[in-house]
């Protein structure tokens, strides 16, 4: 998907509101040093597909974080204000029901959260140069 | 817990230039930006300008454009400021500021503040 | 560049009193954060991105607005709340508005 066309502010109000502390409840009692940054995006949509991957795409060692309160939220922001998005998702969400697995909480999925906060920051961080 | 650790105060000649650091512990020094902020006595806030330690860019307000100059040296995990042709104007306290955890437009952790006198 | 406008530049409040500063931009921002200073210290974050509450600050503050008029309330005012309250936004670059102090009567 290309997140070109979304309305970037309209996510921003969507992740200040409720996403950010969402984020927080599910990194309560981690540090912040724990985890290093090693995933990084250069402009919004950018960063909106970073965010997309991590939040949607399991991985090794975390295949639990679309069902999280976050990720739904996240979902919805991007259906609600990005034009087509929700269309592309019908058959990831139909092969997601097929492979649900338990909510776990792995060290893996705090580090991949650690990732989304920060990507998160660089979506809604001022520009510095004009692009 | 993040801290952000200023220079001590100084006291400079008009004309002279001034560099002042702003060492960060506590964080990723390269994943938030480091502002710096004005403060004359008895005044309010101005802010002069940006610096993303990841890369260097820079922000200035167009007022400190031609005063101030940002770098950074990430393997310190320190910011610097430093103020030429300086003037009794520039008298005031200076703070490093960086972002909030969530997003980066508000100033969360400010340093203690940096004093610069200028007196002949 | 977007001039705000603190309002009133110095008040006087009670015990106990509920208190609205007040914060008008020249131009529509999106967001407004507020911060407090006290006498020969730093400021410290007390409102971000119009209405969320930074870490640790009490649930006595409170912050509103849109466009060009935001505010912050204090509900019940505390003699600890005695300081200077600054309004702040990052629209092209960031400004900070002249500044509100706060004496308790």
């Known amino acids: 998907y290309d997140f070109t066309n979304c309305d970037f502010e309209k996510i921003k109000a969507a992740y200040l509101s409720t996403i950010s502390k969402d984020l927080i409840t599910y990194m309560s009692g981690t540090k912040s040093t724990e985890f290093n940054n090693t995933v990084s995006c250069s402009n919004r949509p950018h960063c909106l597909t970073e965010i997309q991957s991590l939040t949607f795409n399991p991985t090794a060692g975390c295949a639990s974080l679309a069902k999280e309160m976050f990720a739904m939220k996240t979902k919805a922001a991007l259906a609600i204000w990005c034009p087509g998005y929700s269309e592309t998702q019908i058959n990831a969400t139909q092969a997601m029901k097929k492979r649900r697995k338990r909510k776990v909480t792995t060290n893996k999925c705090l580090e991949q959260v650690s990732q989304l906060q920060g990507l998160w920051r660089r979506f809604n961080r001022p520009l510095l140069k004009q692009q | 817990e993040v801290q952000l650790q200023q220079s001590g105060p100084v006291l400079v000649k008009p004309g002279a230039s001034v560099k002042m650091s702003c060492k960060a512990s506590g964080y990723t020094f390269t994943d938030y930006y480091m502002n710096w902020v004005k403060q004359s006595h008895g005044k309010s806030l101005e802010w002069i300008g940006v610096?993303?330690?990841?890369?260097?860019?820079?922000k200035f307000n167009q007022r400190f454009k031609d005063k101030a100059t940002l770098t950074v040296d990430e393997s310190s995990s320190t910011a610097y400021m430093e103020l030429n042709s300086l003037t009794s104007e520039d008298s005031a306290v200076y703070y490093c500021?960086?972002?909030?955890?969530?997003?980066?437009?508000?100033?969360?952790?400010w340093g203690q503040g940096t004093l610069v006198t200028v007196s002949a | 560049q977007i001039v705000l406008t603190q309002s009133p530049s110095i008040m006087s409040a009670s015990l106990g009193e509920e208190i609205t500063l007040t914060c008008s931009a020249s131009?529509?921002?999106?967001?407004m954060h507020w911060y407090q200073q006290k006498s020969g210290t730093s400021p410290k974050l007390l409102i971000y991105f119009t209405s969320n509450l930074a870490s640790g600050v009490p649930s006595r503050f409170s912050g509103s607005g849109s466009g060009t008029f935001y505010s912050l309330t204090i509900s019940s005012v505390e003699a600890e709340d005695a300081a200077d309250y600054y309004c702040h936004q990052w629209s092209s670059y960031p400004t900070f508005g002249g500044g509100t102090k706060l004496e308790i009567k």
């Open positions: 500021a960086r972002g909030d955890d969530y997003a980066e437009e508000s100033f969360a952790y």
């Open positions: 131009s529509s921002v999106s967001y």
């Open positions: 610096i993303n330690p990841y890369n260097a860019d820079t």
